[in-house]
Amino acid sequence: QPSCRQEEFLVGDECCPMCNPGYHVKQVCSEHTGTVCAPCPPQTYTAHANGLSKCLPCGVCDPDMGLLTWQECSSWKDTVCRCIPGYFCENQDGSHCSTCLQHTTCPPGQRVEKRGTHDQDTVCADCLTGTFSLGGTQEECLPWTNCSAFQQEVRRGTNSTDTTCSSQ
């Protein structure tokens, strides 16, 4: 059995040149004739040189999975799906996203260090000593309140709560 060159495919014991992206094999090569290719029908594609008898079906972006169509399918490129705002891609296969997850909400005591994008989750960071955050979408930790000379510190601040001052 012969081993075919790159971008050739085996038919019986003959190697045939592959079709161009956007096409599929209509008729395999023969002794005198090269591979005859045909354009991919609508909603199908081939992204690479290929020996396929049928083009591949275009992907569908499922809104129930948090997906929206970012780039329509063409004869040589699959549909590109992206996550809806507020979600990021959990399963990425090349340029194709299959499932999305909601961006993490930073817990109390943390701030948003990096906002979530369509392909990356939110990155949270701890508040430094002397600052606090209630969490959520807060990008900066707030400094603890300094009780005034006429106030008494009842409870020291934590990374998630402010200092509590009393007026007595």
């Epitope: 050739e8 040149p17 096409y23 090569c29 004739t33 591979t35 290719c37 040189a49």
Partner: antibody, heavy 117, light 108 residues
Amino acid sequence: EVQLLESGGGLVQPGGSLRLSCAASEFTFSSYAMHWVRQAPGKGLEWVSSITSASSYIDYADSVKGRFTISRDNSKNTLYLQMNSLRAEDTAVYYCARGTRGLFDHWGQGTLVTVSS
Amino acid sequence: EIVLTQSPGTLSLSPGERATLSCRASRSVGKYLAWYQQKPGQAPRLLIYLGSNRASGIPDRFSGSGSGTDFTLTISRLEPEDFAVYYCQQYGSSPPITFGQGTKVEIK
């Protein structure tokens, strides 16, 4: 000897139309795939379109897709190329050629198409 | 599409000399490559098909070799009538059918 004779070329304005014909003789026209190949002045060869013997399969170059239509009449031994929405870059000598799929074993002498205002 | 690159662009030789023309494909075309000769004001003429088969009526000083991506047209001894432009063309995967940009063989 195989003979292919193109006609229908000429001067046409951008956006205009032209229909080229290729009269074939001295071979069984209905048994062969036929092709159009063009050559811009001083440039190389560019495949334009192909049609199989029974018109069951037709191909076009991307540069002419949607504007040009290849057809044949086996009873008249004639190949046609209907050219619409012509552009300056379509200016070329248009050759009709006989052959198996993708191979051109006999060529006509060509007809010049000039697209200019 | 498969791109064919011919080299050199121009070959300056004397009658009786050997001419070697190259055609390289951007990806494999198998054995499905043809060579054509074109003289000024004339239609192209098929010389070689399937990489190495001479077309009907072509003198045996013309020979073709190669497969896959690298092909060569050799004219063993140049005759005065051989000075012309030579084109390679692939039909390994079509459409589209593609031609090389041509090599001009001129008298030195």
